[in-house]
Interface confidence: low
């Protein structure tokens, strides 16, 4: 049963066995296609999402789709039902929290009332002043906060009060990648990851430890990527992992926050990376143990000079190393968190490519979270 | 796909220079580090040198340094080599190739005969 | 300059058979190893990148192995189209260099 389970796969309606390696090939194998069901599928960018969080205090901003123009929200009349509303659009289906937030001096958009729609916030026809002085500072999911927080070294082994977001991605009860859990239901990782195997059964995800074989596996139920895009063959690094059940939270299961979609950080920003890749950029063997480091945001004209990527990294990426090498993500990592920390950790990179690990000049290069908030929500409201 | 293009191929005498162009389409050209690569007739490759997209800085192997310039246009998303004081030993196909580290992309190379 | 030295400079071999071929560098270059397959007439075409990664759309029998200055392509069995000359390249060092080639043909 075991190996006819590791090398073939059922179809139905004709009973018969086909190999596995004929999973997600492309061709239907099986007369009712269900061998080419389970496979890690594409989702386009879709359209924008109308409601985004800034991160002057987490406040909400509203589109008017007819201006184009964006608005902060007023607290003025705002409910638990438009909070709910906010964060459906966002494709949370959690229960939200809001306060109040005075107008600080350093608001740029204007601030108008909120009212609903059609299941959508739109802004209050006749809105007069913000009554009430504040925005609505609003968090959909409660995110980001760990048991113990680490101190700043160079490379240490971690622990998972620390990272309790960070989970194995395993193919074949092997450790494939690294991922972070996003909410009871997602995981978040790269899309490099699942290259080679493309079909969604014999994946696994790991959570709760911060030793590799020690913890019990959960089953997928849905891999999601974005449609490749052939100009530029390393952007779009990031997949969206569903799990068939969802995760109970506790001290070392937890989600972490997304990032703001304005959270530019600026060169030099502290930054953590974890995961249980090759210790050493020649080859070395793969972590058992979860191992962090501090690293900083490096600047992308840095990052593309003549002697580093020069060109190769997009504004849909962002680097991170230490300037004089030697504290890197490698192979095994890949997947995995970048980590910033304000009132919350937010993940605001995905552990993607580079080369050799460690190098002065060719530091990590990470997927930039903020560019795909749009793509996450867009999958998050298909799949509610 | 990103897609290099090549201008055709050039017969030169002896000392004179050469000029070849390499466009690029299908993505944002700032993002495209150029290097450009010869191969001499029944030879193997041999790097000539590089530009970076964004700062128009160069790398050039030390073999032809002085004797070759490249540059962009960035307005037509075209880079450009050009080897000075030419002699028999530069025939080659030149090709323009896409990427810092590695390419996938590449021109379809331009002949370069050089004959009295 | 880094010197990449490859190794055999031609070989022959029939439909089917397992190709090895090897690269040294004259100093350590990490991963920063390529391989390319050049045909005829044709420009080169990138078939794995930093040492061992498949680039996409090129066939799984192609693999690459090694790290610090020795560095290997294998084809694990050998198809028609496979027969052409293959270049190892570093891009450790700002100033890309490459192996002399090696030329696989038909036995």
């Known amino acids: 049963k075991v190996i006819l389970d590791k090398y073939y796969f059922l179809c139905g309606q004709p009973l018969h066995f086909i190999p596995r390696k004929q999973l997600c090939d492309g061709e239907l194998d099986c007369p009712l296609g269900e061998d080419e069901e389970h496979c890690v599928k594409s989702f386009p960018e879709g359209p924008a999402v109308a409601v985004r969080l800034s991160k002057d205090r987490s406040t909400l901003q509203v589109l008017d789709s007819a201006t184009g123009n964006w608005f902060s929200a007023c607290f003025d009349n705002f409910t638990e039902a438009l909070a709910e509303t906010a964060c459906r659009q966002m494709g949370y289906s959690s229960k939200p929290t809001f306060r109040a937030v005075e107008i600080g001096p350093d608001q740029d958009l204007d601030v108008v009332e909120i009212t609903e729609n059609s299941q959508e916030l739109r802004m209050r026809n006749s809105s007069g002043p913000c009554l009430s002085g504040s925005l609505v500072s609003l968090h959909c999911l409660a995110c980001g906060k760990s048991l113990k927080t680490p101190r700043v070294v160079g490379v240490e082994e971690a622990s998972v009060d620390s990272w309790p977001w960070q989970v194995s991605i395993q193919y074949d009860k092997q450790h494939v990648c690294g991922g972070s859990i996003l909410d009871p239901h997602w995981v978040l990782t790269a899309a490099h990851c699942f290259r080679k195997h493309t079909d969604v059964f014999n994946w696994k995800v790991r959570a709760g430890s911060d030793k590799l074989g020690s913890f019990p596996s959960l089953a997928v139920a849905k891999i999601i990527i974005i449609e490749f895009n052939p100009m530029y063959p390393k952007d779009n690094d990031i997949a969206l992992m569903k799990l068939q059940f969802p995760l109970t939270f506790s001290g070392t299961v937890r989600p972490i926050c997304l990032p703001f979609f304005d959270e530019e950080l600026t060169p030099a920003t502290p930054l953590w990376i974890i995961g249980w890749g090759f210790t050493k950029q020649n080859g070395g063997k793969m972590s058992d143990i979860l191992l962090q480091a501090s690293v900083q945001v490096i600047d992308s004209t840095r990052c593309n000079a003549d002697d580093a990527y020069q060109g190769e990294v997009t504004e849909k990426m962002m680097c991170a190393g230490i300037p004089e090498g030697g504290v890197d993500t490698c192979q095994g990592d890949s997947g995995g968190p970048l980590m910033y920390q304000s009132d919350q950790w937010h993940v605001v990179g995905i552990v993607s490519w580079g080369y050799g690990c460690g190098g002065p000049s060719t530091p990590g290069v990470y997927t930039k979270v903020s560019a795909y908030l749009n793509w996450i929500y867009n999958v998050w409201k298909a799949e509610l | 796909q990103v897609q290099l293009v090549q201008s055709g191929a050039e017969v030169k005498k002896p000392g004179a220079s050469v000029k070849v162009s390499c466009k690029a389409s299908g993505g944002t050209f700032s993002n495209y580090a150029i290097s450009w690569v010869r191969q001499a007739p029944g030879q193997g490759l041999e790097w000539v040198g590089r530009i970076n997209p964004n700062s128009g800085g160069t790398n050039y192997a030390q073999k032809f340094q002085g004797r070759v310039t490249m540059t962009r246009d960035t307005s037509t998303s075209t880079v450009y080599m050009e080897l000075s004081s030419l002699r028999s030993e530069d025939t080659a196909v030149y090709y323009c190739?896409?990427?810092?580290?590695?390419?996938?992309?590449w021109g379809q190379g331009t002949l370069v005969t050089v004959s009295s | 300059d880094i010197q990449m030295t490859q190794s055999p400079s031609s070989l022959s071999a029939s439909v089917g058979d397992r190709v090895t071929i090897t690269c040294r560098a004259s100093q350590s270059i990490n991963n920063y190893l390529n391989w390319y397959q050049q045909k005829p007439g044709k420009a080169p075409k990138l078939l794995i990148y930093a040492a061992s990664s498949l680039q996409s759309g090129v066939p799984s029998r192609f693999s690459g192995s090694g790290s610090g200055t020795d560095f290997t392509l294998t084809i694990s069995s050998l198809q028609p189209e496979d027969f052409a000359t293959y270049y190892c390249?570093?891009?450790?060092?700002?100033?890309?260099?490459f192996g002399q080639g090696t030329k696989v043909e038909i036995k």
């Open positions: 390249q570093q891009s450790y060092s700002t100033k890309w260099t």
């Open positions: 190739a896409r990427g810092r580290y590695s390419s996938s992309s």
